[in-house]
Interface confidence: low
Amino acid sequence: SLLQSALDFLAGPGSLGGASGRDQSDFVGQTVELGELRLRVRRVLAEGGFAFVYEAQDVGSGREYALKRLLSNEEEKNRAIIQEVCFMKKLSGHPNIVQFCSAASIGKEESDTGQAEFLLLTELCKGQLVEFLKKMESRGPLSCDTVLKIFYQTCRAVQHMHRQKPPIIHRDLKVENLLLSNQGTIKLCDFGSATTISHYPDYSWSAQRRALVEEEITRNTTPMYRTPEIIDLYSNFPIGEKQDIWALGCILYLLCFRQHPFEDGAKLRIVNGKYSIPPHDTQYTVFHSLIRAMLQVNPEERLSIAEVVHQLQEIAAARNVNPKSPITELLEQNGGYGSATLSRGPPPPVGPAGSGYSGGLALAEYDQPYGGFLDILRGGTERLFTNLKDTSSKVIQSVANYAKGDLDISYITSRIAVMSFPAEGVESALKNNIEDVRLFLDSKHPGHYAVYNLSPRTYRPSRFHNRVSECGWAARRAPHLHTLYNICRNMHAWLRQDHKNVCVVHCMDGRAASAVAVCSFLCFCRLFSTAEAAVYMFSMKRCPPGIWPSHKRYIEYMCDMVAEEPITPHSKPILVRAVVMTPVPLFSKQRSGCRPFCEVYVGDERVASTSQEYDKMRDFKIEDGKAVIPLGVTVQGDVLIVIYHARSTLGGRLQAKMASMKMFQIQFHTGFVPRNATTVKFAKYDLDACDIQEKYPDLFQVNLEVEVEPRDRPSREAPPWENSSMRGLNPKILFSSRE
């Protein structure tokens, strides 16, 4: 089933031993096989609506884990569970997020409970933060430095979520979802309410639409932590990541003053932001303005998570505290440091879902249907998962982001790593420190790594033993095809040279550009035959890369060039007669049409522009049905067509001036335009750099009217694919021999 293959992909196959038909308490004492692990289920840690969390021990290594067992009897719940697993896997590896280990499922057909069963394995934490805080209460208030460390580490976890593309919103941040690791650091858990969906209510929203959104959000949030924009949807404030900032403000207040700012969850007080900082507090004054900045009624006035983290860093610097360090003062209160197991007393009392210790997995009440399904489960999935099932399950094992400490480095396969820019100086406090990166790579892959810098910025290649390839391209552009092909060929040659060799790819943030290169390389090595599958793997191993349609198009070109029946790009020039947009896009201030002009680039050179004086450019109205820009330009190679809307503005001295607004852009390679083509069609989802959806009518498409010249016009230099053999390309090269 689709569901099973999704979980197979996420974790490698897992069989649920012989546990399937037992009730939850019978599960204790059983042995469960999960991937490579054989787990003895030791005891119940917590339970909720239809989920139990157990302490489990790997029979082989003796290592302890938290094992969450979920039962589901409907498809919607299944999808919600998969979404939670996907979020966990995507976010896992960050030092302040509970480490995902594995997941597996069996369908209701094989289970004698008559329900689908899911197992989710994570690291076992020492306990819930609230338990440790309760034990410390007798000693008086927390020190300012303890609050700083707890809160900073919590914010770092949320920052990791908000940095994803699209951002992941937790929606249920509360102290109960903070765990303390064995090392004494904060770990955020429970992604059962998380979403990537933001809402932008406005006056046009009907009461019914508001009610639906409100109902879905209410199901996924905790009353005390609900935000003004959620409680009063008619305020028309955006509902997005700033929900989490409000909740963090509540957490900071609670850590400081030992009570919640909205203890009673009174809607009126929340909507009006009516809370008060204890007037005589002098201990936590350093946090007062931060609390106020996070508990702003208007979400747009709240700080972003980046700003919160940076302000906390400044407080930490002023107080000479390392905010990332373990909160040992909490552990010292609780029977020594770093023991892996909880006290052996009776299990904690069972409360409602989400209460009690969950060992890395908070329990979500899944009994109600869930909203916000995972993007990849919408359309096109069968093909995607079929592709993935065809690959060895060992290929897709989980390798954590943040391979060492705080380094932002992710292994896409055991021989391909992606990281953010290795920075020097003060900048390295926010990004990968180049020295730390080198130390890490030198210790993990001594003499066997090559670095591929896809960013426009450079550093001394000697930092990485002169094994640095500078192969960047312009931001917000697809790479030139020959550049992309050369990167793939070079990486392949390096991996082939020695089985210990690895490729380390980076752009600025290790996202879009890195994803294009790495996904192209996965396809080049024939691990995948579609861009979609490659991009999905990248998303799971690192983060959703936020790439544009043209980026995907160029990855597809790579798939075509190495296919069993390869498509080699032809060398025929193309005459672009005109750009035709149907229906007319709505970019004028009155939303009645547009006044378009066009720029054409070949490679990095602008070869044509239809821009003229404002009045000489035609104004197209909706009733025209289509907007046509005559071009008559011959192109060959990598082409970028940018379409602008011309706007009249009054300049200084009341002179008419023209402002331009980008409507969209298209990037493609002429070598893949079929030889007999007269029209090249681009749907709305094929266009880059689009504006808000309302400006493009339904079924909007762009057609290039073209004519392919019959004769080849070879370029001065033969393209790299011409003298390149596609034989011997094998996905095995992407993995170390032991895999």
């Epitope: 007037p279 004054t285 303005s289 106020r292 900045a293 980046a306 400044e314 407080i315 002023a318």
Partner: antibody
């Protein structure tokens, strides 16, 4: 010893632009926030703008919002204030100061900006 | 915006006098108040932060008190070098407004 040295002031016409710089030394520049404060001739102090250690957080007085931009280059230990659409009322001595989260603990000697036709 | 009102706007006193300057905020600012001293042609100097904390290197004759909306700066025994203009400043998020200043002159 902490030192802050402003430069870039001078005479400019209304509507014109000017860029002030503040070179910092004697402390870890990238470790904390920085601010600009101004003082019109014979008048009191007016806070203008602040920036967090990384440059992510920027804050402006209403009187300059949309016209002034604060920025910093931590590799050069330098703070900047880009002032556009200058008005006569922007005439002042501009001080850069280290922003110790809630207070301004070290100040430069100031640079005079005169906006006049 | 939060308005800061200092009083008096000017004050004459003699060496050895005890002097008090007050500052009132238009709304509660907890203890987010700082005091600065400025001499003619010079940059301001931080004296007191967080209403009552003495900045290092500042003589102990300077002290600050208050919270909420009413604050005072006290110089217990005026010295010749203390004749200057004094400013209060609120640092309650997010705009850091100053009082109009109090000029302390030799009687």
């Amino acid at each position: 010893e902490v030192q802050l040295l402003e430069s870039g002031g001078g005479l400019v016409q209304p509507g014109g632009s000017l860029r002030l710089s503040c070179a910092a030394s004697g402390f870890t520049f990238g470790g904390g926030g920085m601010s600009w404060v101004r003082q019109a001739p014979g008048k009191g102090l007016e806070w203008v703008s602040s920036i967090s250690s990384s440059g992510y957080g920027t804050y402006y007085a209403d009187s300059v919002k949309g016209r002034f931009t604060i920025s910093r280059d931590n590799s050069k230990n330098t703070l900047y204030l880009q002032m556009n659409s200058l008005r006569a009322e922007d005439t002042a001595v501009y001080y850069c100061a280290r922003w110790g989260w809630s207070y301004l603990d070290y100040w430069g000697q100031g640079t005079l900006v005169t906006v006049s036709s | 915006d939060i308005q800061m009102t200092q009083s008096p706007s000017s004050l004459s006193a003699s060496v050895g006098d005890r002097v008090t300057i007050t500052c009132r905020a238009s709304q509660s600012i907890s203890s987010y108040l700082n005091w600065y001293q400025q001499k003619p042609g010079k940059a301001p100097k931080l004296l007191i932060y967080a209403a009552s904390s003495l900045q290092s290197g500042v003589p102990s004759r300077f002290s600050g008190s208050g919270s909420g909306t009413d604050f005072t700066l006290t110089i217990s025994s005026l010295q010749p070098e203390d004749f200057a203009t004094y400013y209060c400043q609120q640092s309650y998020y997010p705009l850091y407004t100053f009082g109009q200043g109090t000029k302390l002159e030799i009687k």
